[in-house]
Structure formats: C-alpha cells, structure tokens
C-alpha cells in the first residue's frame, strides 16, 4: 500500500488518483506522434520534438521546463561517399558490395533523412585483407581462437556476429586482437525467432535490415572530448586524438543477406563447435581467408563517416515539492533515435510523457509532491548516454547532495512476455510492493497482480516465490548517476520470454523497421503491457517523491552483499594453492559484510519505531537511507575506469550491459593464471578486496546511529 | 612437398618406456597442429591427441589422458609420442598426421610406426 | 562426444557401379566431416572435407554430400584401385574429433 502523506488529496487516494488517470489511449497518440520522422541526435528533427516537448510538458502543469544545451562529439556517416565493404579479386576489382541503405518499409519510402546502417564513431578508413570470423567477438571467443586454436586475427578483418554483449566490447577485443577493422551483422540465430515472419508482417528481421549503433568504450565519461565536465561554452575540448573511448579500426554493420556472401566463402579452420554456428547456409569456418577457389579474393572496409562536435538537448522538467524541494527524484529517458525509434525510445517516451501529463492533472487540482521530482527527456543516449552525463557533471554538486532516486524510462517493452527490472537493492521491497497493487495485464493472469504473474513467469533463482530483479550493469542513461554518482537507479520494462526465445535484444532493434506499425500490430495493439509500464515506473517515482519515509529498505542490500561475497570467495577459490602462497584472504570482506548486516537491522528497528511527527529526526533518518547508496562510491574509481565509483556494482568489463558485482575484485582475478607476474596480481587482489572492506564497512557506519 | 617421417617400428616390453617420433618437412612447422592416432592390428582409426609445435600447447582425447605424453621440439621440426610404462595393449600402429586447419581434418600423414609390446 | 556410425561395415559393388557409403552423427556438426580411404599397409587419405570439398588430386567420381547429421560419400563410376577402406571423421568439437568405424569397399 502507498505510505504517501496527503497534501491536498487524502491519503489513500493520492496513489490510486496519479495511477487512474494514466491511459493506454495516450501512451498510443504519444508514441504515434514521436515516431513520424527520425529524430538522430543533432538534427534539426530532434531539436523541433524537444522544443515541442518543452511546450507540452508546460501544458501539462510541470512547474518549470528548461533545454539544456551541450556540444558533445557525434558521428555521421558522409552524405555524398557511402559506407560499404566488397569482396576484392586478385586485380583489385569489386566483384560484390554490400548494401548501402536498409530497403525502407511500406509507407515510409519518401521520408527523407533516414540514417544509412553505420557504427557511430568508426574512424574512417580502407582496411583490405583476409576475413576471420569471431563468433560474438566476446572474450572467450577470442581467447578460444587465439590462445586455444593457435589463429591469429592480427591483421586481419574480423567479421562478428551482434549479440551477447555490448558491440564496443566486441570493437575493444577485437583492436587488442590486433585486427585491422571489424564487420558487425545479425545473425538470424540471434535476430529471427523461429515461426515468426519478418517485418512487415512480423517482428523479425529481414535479411536487408541492419542494427546501427555506437562502438565507443567510454566507461562512463559522457562526451570524449569533455570527460569529468559539461560540453557547455566555455569547456575546454581533447584533441581527437585524446578522446576517450574512440575505437582504431574501422568497424561497419551489415545485414543477414550481405553476410551470407561473405561467410559462404570462408575457409581455413572450421569453427571449434557448434556454439559457434549460426542459422545461416554457410559452414561457419574460422578463416583465415576464403577457401580453395576463392583464395585469390580480398575483403576490403570503405568507410568515410565524419565525428564532429554538434549541438544536443535535454528537457529538463521540474515538479516542485511540497515539504522537501531540495530532495530530488528523477525520471528520465532519451528522446534521440536512430530512424523511427518505435520501440527505442520513444515507447518510454510515450509512457514518461503520460506520467508527466497524469502529475501534472493533479498539479492542477492543488497536489504536490513531498519531494521534487525532476523529469528528464535526454539526447544523443545513442551516441554514448552523452545527454544525460553532460547533464549530471553540470549538476553534480547538487545532484550528490540532493538526488534521492532515478528511474530510467527508455523502452517500455523488449517483448511482451513478462516485467523485467533491474534496481538498487533498495528499490527491492518498493518494488514488490508496488507491483502486487498493480494488476497483471497478461493473458492468463486477470484479475491477478503483476507481481504473481511476474514471479510465475521470471522465478527469482533464490528466493521461491519472488520474481527476478537484476543488477543494473550500463548501457543506458540511469549510468551516471548510478555509476558515478551513487544515486539510488532502477529500471523496468516488459520483456521476451528468455527461456524460448534466445535472439539477443529484439529483432529489429535499431534498424529503420522499428515503427510505430511493429509496435501497435505486433508487441502490444491495445496499449497494455506499456500502460503497466507506466504504472511501474510512475507508481515508483510516486512513493520515491511522496512517501513520508523513504521506500528503500537497506536490510535487502546486506542480503545482496552477502551473496555477492561468497561469489567473488568461490571465484578466488579457484586458486586455493595462490591464496595461500600470497596469504589472500576474505575474512575482512565477510567481516564488513556481518557488520553491515546487523548494523542494517538495527537501523530498520529504529526506522520503523521513530517518531515520524518530528521533522528533524524524519529528514535525518531519510538522509541516512538517501545517501546509503552514495556512501558505496569510491572517490578514487575503479582502476583505469575513474568514472565507474560504485564498489558493489559496475558494468562488466567485457560487456557493458551486464553489471558485475564486486568488480574491483572480480577484474583483478579475471585471467589472474595468465599473468607474468603472479605476486604483482595477487597483491592487486588484497589491494581490491581491503578496498571493498573498507566501503562496506565505511556504508555501514553511515546506518549507525548518529551519536 | 610437406612430408612427415616417422620413426621406424619398435619391439618392446611390457613396463618398458618409449619415444617415437615425427618429422616434418616441406612447411611451416610451428604453423600448424600435429595429431597422433592409434590403430589397433584390424581396428580402425582413434584420435589421441594434438600438439601445437609453435608453443607446445597440447590436448589429450579422454582415452589416452595420461596414458601417453606428446611433445615438440620445434627446433628440429619433430613431435614425439611417448609412453613410460607400456602395456601389451598398446600393441598397434600409430600415425602421425597434420591438422589442415586448427580445427579440420588431417591433410597429411605419416607412414606410421608399429609398435609392438611383447613379452 | 559425437558419436559417428558408418553404414554398410562392408560394400560389396562392381567396377564402373555407383558405390554409396554412409556416415551418421550423433548431434549436429554443420559441414564439419572428412572422408579418407585407407588401403592394406598404407596411412589413411584425405579425400573430402567440409563434407564435400575434394582435396587437390582427387578424382572427381568421389564426392560428398550431407549437413548436420546425414553425411554421404559416393563414387560414381568405380574402379578396382578404389578398393579400400572408407573412414568418416567430425572436426566439429574442437580439439575433439572422432572416426567412424569404417566401411570396407570390395570391388566384385
């Protein structure tokens, strides 16, 4: 039940009013109206939406709605000399090139500006050579091919398939590979659902569409030519040649069509197994180089775009509180895409702008909020969450001291299976309370709360009759402040079923067929599954803005951490015969970790018995639950990614949308067998784990009573 | 012309220890695996394991994991197969034979050694 | 591992006749399946390989064909020296592989 107080609408009603009056019918003209045109970061197209954003969010009632400009670094492919790759004969000639646009879908053939498939920030370049194929290009993919197989993709072109993990890590391994570009492409394993047509009449993917998207590995520094400050007037701007997280090959993507041509001719070694095949025609052979009668044949990369520093522009919308307008809850999500952006993003889009629209009917009647919520319409979340990092680094200072909570809204759904949520350990209980007052819309399931089909449908794999909350990794614009700045973030969307539908994201993912056609003829015609959306992420932004006490629950977290323990022990456990060479041990880590827990109790005892008539021991109690999460940041970061500060969390280093716990440990354990200098390695181990000692107890501390 | 000469057949005892070996000529020989494989008099072909001259990387089919050692010494272009203790049934012959690729079939072979274990 | 079974253990055909030998797998290995011919005191011989490539010098009234689980060597028009036998190989699980237990080929 909401814990919310009344301002001017009684209490019980103050939740159930905002929820009633988010309709299914405005998400649909929403995303209707944002999903005409393409609107790329720096076009005029996405300025004019942000403009009109601003105009309606002022309708709607929101206090005050500012742009905030910044001139960060994006990437355009060159208008006049087109990106491809051809197959080269022994002469030099081009006995075939792959396609330069994706043919458009019905009805959108005259809309001008669609961006041709490329992978924003490639440098530009004329690579020729033999091919190998890499597999998804993850780590272990390259550590099969090269240290187990013996093959050497130094100098070569290596061409990967899309999916698994995020495609700058692929880039990453593949210039450490020592490879001289990188072709991307889906593969319909990954891409096409089995007995499902392709788009227009399914949600699959064609074999002529291709997923665009950026190749960067900034590791959370926003703008590579800014990082740590705002890309405003007066920054002082990088070289290029300093920028951060700009990849050193070229790299292009391509459909399933265009593939098939090149990987019919591989030859050399055949891939190590069958987890490394496809569903295309081809052998799926290793290379290098074509085979027997096509040995003579070349591939060769002609990629021409452009990066150059370009305007953007955020939304800023503000909702006043009513008691604490200095405690700030966020709800922000991009506006940019990269054609139409059906589901990516303006299905979250939609659903923020009828969050907005529905606070801001009971603005009018004369309700506020407790605390301020600030809402967030976020550019260039394509090119790099470069939007939302500019904004944060300008408004660090007070975001630190005043940032309660940020919900992230980019898609509303993924699938229309089942909830998906990522979040704060201290989100956990809001969340499960929240989705059991919330009514399931799957089929099935009527009358039922989402939180019963939720859990019937993603099991948690711990705890029995709980459903699954992930770690938040990267990836999206919640990384900043969660990251960086220790901001309590969660996320929620619906989703695919994972068990049967293994393909990597959607099928259409970032390619001109995501329309608002797919969106109301395929995923979800009468506006449901996103309307629940709606309804998670505003419901959440609700209690995190009005209730008296903060919904978080640091009790969760001490059950996380413990658990996070004994996985990165089992890890080091591995190497029983290092740790005791190095004297390598956990005890202070577990210690920490048995303080916090029982510190978390007793907080929680107190929380619960206080005397919430007296405002200044209210504020100081929801002071210590606000900046629990930011007492997890280690100023200093993690080594050689000093914007990723967060000791518990942080994207994987070998894939950015997955979060790793304990990463400071984890990385240094990573491949430790491997290292030159084993006694340097396992002390860069202890290293880790005094630091992660000393945040867990240093967070505990900050549970304790305050004198 | 890549070639590979094994040395020549070998009479022994059981409990007895044995090295034979394998030549290559013709090619790069730290460029590309070797495998040996057993034939057993009137039997068919069992892979037994791979060795990658260039650094002496080797993997073992399960069957013979620590019932034979292969080794490289990439310096005279040579991979050996070696037993320490040898049974009656290891009486057979064995070939050596190159990868084509890392993973890919045997594009050449030796001309086998026979081994025969006798007491 | 990948189970291989060869089928007939033996093969009984007349020269200039079509000879057709089998090669089934346990699981599927895509293309990944050699064929070689072993005569009476010699090493074994590539023949084929990504289940129908010829290696150089072979003639061509050897062939190979299949994907995936069904794999079949054929010799259009045969002749006496063809008279061997036929070994199938998967290299699809690396560093594993694995032989068929053969099919003998006797010209009548």
């Known amino acids: 039940k909401s814990s919310s107080e009344a301002t001017n609408i009684t209490p019980k009603h103050n939740m159930k009013a905002f929820l009633d009056e988010l309709k299914a019918e405005n998400i649909k003209k929403f995303l209707h109206n944002f999903t005409q045109i393409p609107h790329l970061a720096g076009t005029e197209q996405n300025f004019q939406l942000a403009k009109q954003i601003q105009s309606q969010w002022k309708e709607f009632g929101l206090d005050s709605v500012e742009l905030t400009h910044y001139d960060v670094l994006l990437s355009y492919p060159n208008k006049t000399h087109p990106n491809y790759i051809s197959i080269i004969n022994e002469d030099g000639n081009e006995i075939f090139n792959t396609s330069l646009f994706e043919p458009p879908p019905a009805g959108y053939e005259n809309v001008s500006d669609i961006v041709p498939p490329f992978s924003a920030f490639s440098p530009q370049g004329m690579p020729e050579g033999d091919l190998v194929y890499v597999n998804y290009a993850r780590t272990e993919d390259f550590f099969k091919l090269e240290r187990d197989m013996k093959i050497n993709c130094s100098g070569k072109i290596v061409i990967a398939r899309y999916g698994k993990v995020f495609r700058g890590n692929k880039v990453k391994n593949a210039q450490l590979a020592g490879a001289t570009g990188v072709i991307l492409y889906s593969d319909p394993a990954d891409y096409f659902a089995p007995g499902v047509k392709s788009y227009p009449d399914g949600w699959n993917l064609p074999g002529g569409g291709v997923q665009r998207g950026n190749i960067l590995n900034l590791n959370g520094a926003g703008d590579p030519l800014t990082p740590g400050y705002p890309a405003n007037e007066y920054a002082y701007r990088r070289g290029m040649a300093e920028a951060v997280g700009l990849p050193s090959i070229p790299v292009h993507p391509i459909g399933y069509y265009d593939a098939q041509k090149l990987l019919e001719k591989m030859g050399g070694s055949a891939s190590p197994d069958s987890s490394w095949r496809g569903s295309l025609k081809v052998p799926y052979n290793v290379g290098p180089g074509f085979t027997g009668n096509f040995s003579t044949q070349k591939v060769k990369m002609h990629i021409h775009s452009t990066s150059e520093v370009t305007r953007i522009y955020n939304v800023i919308g503000t909702l006043r509180g009513a008691v604490e307008p200095d405690r700030y809850v966020i709800l922000g999500g991009h506006r940019d895409s990269w054609v139409f952006g059906g589901i990516d993003p303006q299905s979250g889009a939609a659903v923020v702008h009828e969050i907005v629209r529905s606070f801001g009917t009971l603005k009018k009647e004369g309700w506020r909020p407790r605390r301020t919520i600030l809402f967030a319409s976020w550019d260039a979340e394509e090119f790099g969450l470069l939007g939302s990092t500019e904004w944060a680094e300008e408004n660090s200072r007070l975001l630190q001291e005043r940032g309660v909570a940020y919900i992230n809204a980019d898609s509303s759904i993924e699938g229309n299976y089942t909830l998906r949520v990522d979040c704060t350990p201290l989100m956990y209980s809001l969340v499960y309370n929240l989705t059991k007052e919330l009514e399931s819309p799957d089929e099935g399931f009527e009358g039922k709360s989402l939180y019963e089909s939720w859990t019937k449908k993603s099991p948690s794999p711990e705890f029995s009759g709980m459903p699954r909350i992930s770690k938040l990794g990267s990836g999206n614009d919640f990384e900043v402040f969660f990251q960086r700045l220790g901001i309590a973030s969660g996320r929620a969307r619906y989703t695919k079923n994972w068990e049967t539908n293994k393909f990597s994201s959607y099928p259409l993912y970032h390619s001109v067929y995501e329309t608002y056609e797919l969106v109301e003829k395929f995923y979800d015609p009468m506006f449901k599954y996103h309307l629940t959306v709606a309804q998670v992420r505003g419901g959440m932004v609700f209690e995190l803005a009005n209730s008296v006490v903060l919904p978080f629950d640091c009790r969760d977290y001490a059950v996380v951490l413990r658990k996070y323990a004994d996985k990165i022990y089992n890890i080091s456990m591995k190497h029983p015969q290092e740790m005791k060479t190095y004297s390598v041990s956990f005890d202070s880590l577990f210690s920490a970790v048995k303080n916090f827990t029982e510190i978390a109790s007793k907080f929680s005892e107190r929380l619960r018995d206080f005397d919430k008539s007296n405002p200044i021991l209210l504020r100081m109690m929801n002071d210590q639950l606000m900046f629990l999460e930011r007492a997890f940041i280690d100023p200093l970061g993690l080594p050689d990614r000093p914007f990723y500060r967060h000791v518990i969390y942080a994207p994987s280093s070998h894939n950015k949308y997955a979060g790793e716990s304990f990463p400071g440990i984890y990385d240094a354990l990573f491949d430790i067998e491997s290292k030159v200098d084993p006694s340097q390695a396992w002390g860069e181990v202890k290293r880790q784990i005094s630091v992660a000692t000393f945040t867990v107890q240093a967070a505990a501390e900050t549970l304790s009573e305050v004198a | 012309e890549v070639q590979l000469v094994q040395s020549g057949a070998e009479v022994k005892k059981p409990g007895e220890s044995l090295k034979i070996s394998c030549k290559g000529s013709g090619y790069s020989f730290t460029s590309y695996w070797i495998g040996w494989v057993r034939q057993m008099p009137g039997k068919g072909l069992e892979w037994m394991g791979i060795i990658y001259p260039g650094d002496s990387d080797t993997r073992y089919s399960p069957s013979f994991q620590g019932q034979v050692t292969i080794s490289a010494d990439k310096s005279i272009s040579t991979a050996y197969l070696q037993w320490s203790s040898l049974k009656a049934s290891d009486t057979a012959m064995y070939y050596c034979a190159r990868r084509m690729a890392a993973a890919g079939p045997f594009d050449y072979w030796g001309q086998g050694t026979l081994v025969t274990v006798s007491s | 591992g990948i189970v291989m079974t060869q089928s007939p253990a033996t093969l009984s055909v007349s020269p200039g006749e079509r000879a057709t030998l089998s090669c089934r797998t346990s699981q599927s290995i895509g293309w990944n399946l050699a064929w070689y011919q072993q005569k009476p005191g010699q090493a074994p011989r590539l023949l084929i390989y990504?289940?129908?490539s010829r290696t150089t010098g072979i003639p061509a009234r050897f062939s190979g064909s299949g994907s995936g689980t069904e794999f079949t060597l054929t010799i259009s028009s045969l002749q006496s020296e063809d008279s061997a036998v036929y070994y199938c190989?998967?290299?699809?699980?690396?560093?594993?592989?694995?032989f068929g237990q053969g099919t003998e080929l006797e010209i009548k």
């Open positions: 190989q998967h290299y699809d699980n690396w560093p594993m592989c694995s």
């Open positions: 990504g289940a129908s």
